[in-house]
């Protein structure tokens, strides 16, 4: 999906209003310095591409993020403010339902959500030059 036509300001407002708090809740008990940010993004469409990938694509050691509250809200925000996003996700959602596993918070998941927090922060500051 090409995120170029999303309403970035609305997605930012949704993040600041509620998604950010759910990410913090997920990470509660973890020190903010515990993980290094290794995933970056260069502009808002790129950030949303990386956020989608990290939130919804299962990775080795962390297959369970898609049913977390922050993930459901992220999916809803993209569906509302990215024209045509919902239609592209129908097949992906059906595949995800088939392989759904019970929710387990592993260290790998915590690391992944820490990366997500970094991507969201970058999304909210699009005019900053990349280091």
């Amino acid at each position: 999906y090409d995120f170029t036509n999303c309403d970035f300001e609305k997605i930012k407002a949704a993040y600041l209003s509620t998604i950010s708090k759910d990410l913090i809740t997920y990470m509660s008990g973890t020190k903010s310095t515990e993980f290094n940010n290794t995933v970056s993004c260069s502009n808002r469409p790129h950030c949303l591409t990386e956020i989608q990938s990290l939130t919804f694509n299962p990775t080795a050691g962390c297959a369970s993020l898609a049913k977390e509250m922050f993930a459901m809200k992220t999916k809803a925000a993209l569906a509302i403010w990215c024209p045509g996003y919902s239609e592209t996700q129908i097949n992906a959602t059906q595949a995800m339902k088939k392989r759904r596993k019970r929710k387990v918070t592993t260290n790998k998941c915590l690391e992944q959500v820490s990366q997500l927090q970094g991507l969201w922060r970058r999304f909210n500051r699009p005019l900053l030059k990349q280091q």
Epitope: A13, A14, T18, K73, A77, I80
Partner: nanobody, 132 residues
């Protein structure tokens, strides 16, 4: 240009009823979500009730569930808030607000409808005072 005009506020005794109206113009009413917010002195603006003019889906704040009813008349481009069993704590300025994408995505909007930062257009507000 876009306009939202609220009316129907006033002074009422606890246990009484009021019906607020929000008349809209300047946008495609049938695609929009309209939400009633309220703001009491010294408090944050609070989402009270949401309706999608696209499919009629409604959401309510827990504090008003069973007492307030939101409805829409697409022919008149007007949304109503019927407020029954009013309490002193319902005293506030009531605003209606409109958003263009949450109307056509009402199921996904369950997470976001009550957040004022997401709305594009606002009315000037109408005062509701409930005396004990």
């Amino acid at each position: 240009q876009v306009q939202l005009v609220e009316s129907g506020g006033g002074l009422v005794q606890a246990g009484g009823s009021l019906r607020l109206s929000c008349a809209a113009s300047g946008f495609t009413f049938g695609d929009y979500a309209i939400t009633w917010f309220r703001q009491a002195p010294g408090k944050e603006r609070e989402g009270v009730a949401y309706i999608s003019n696209f499919d009629g889906m409604t959401y309510y704040a827990d504090s008003v569930k069973g007492r307030f009813t939101i409805s829409s008349d697409n022919a008149k481009n007007t949304v109503y808030l019927q407020m029954d069993s009013l309490k002193p704590e319902d005293t506030a300025v009531y605003y209606c607000a409109a958003e263009g994408r949450m109307g056509t995505h009402s199921r996904d909007s369950v997470y976001f409808w009550a957040f004022s930062a997401l709305y594009d257009y606002w009315g000037q507000g109408t005062q509701v005072t409930v005396s004990s």
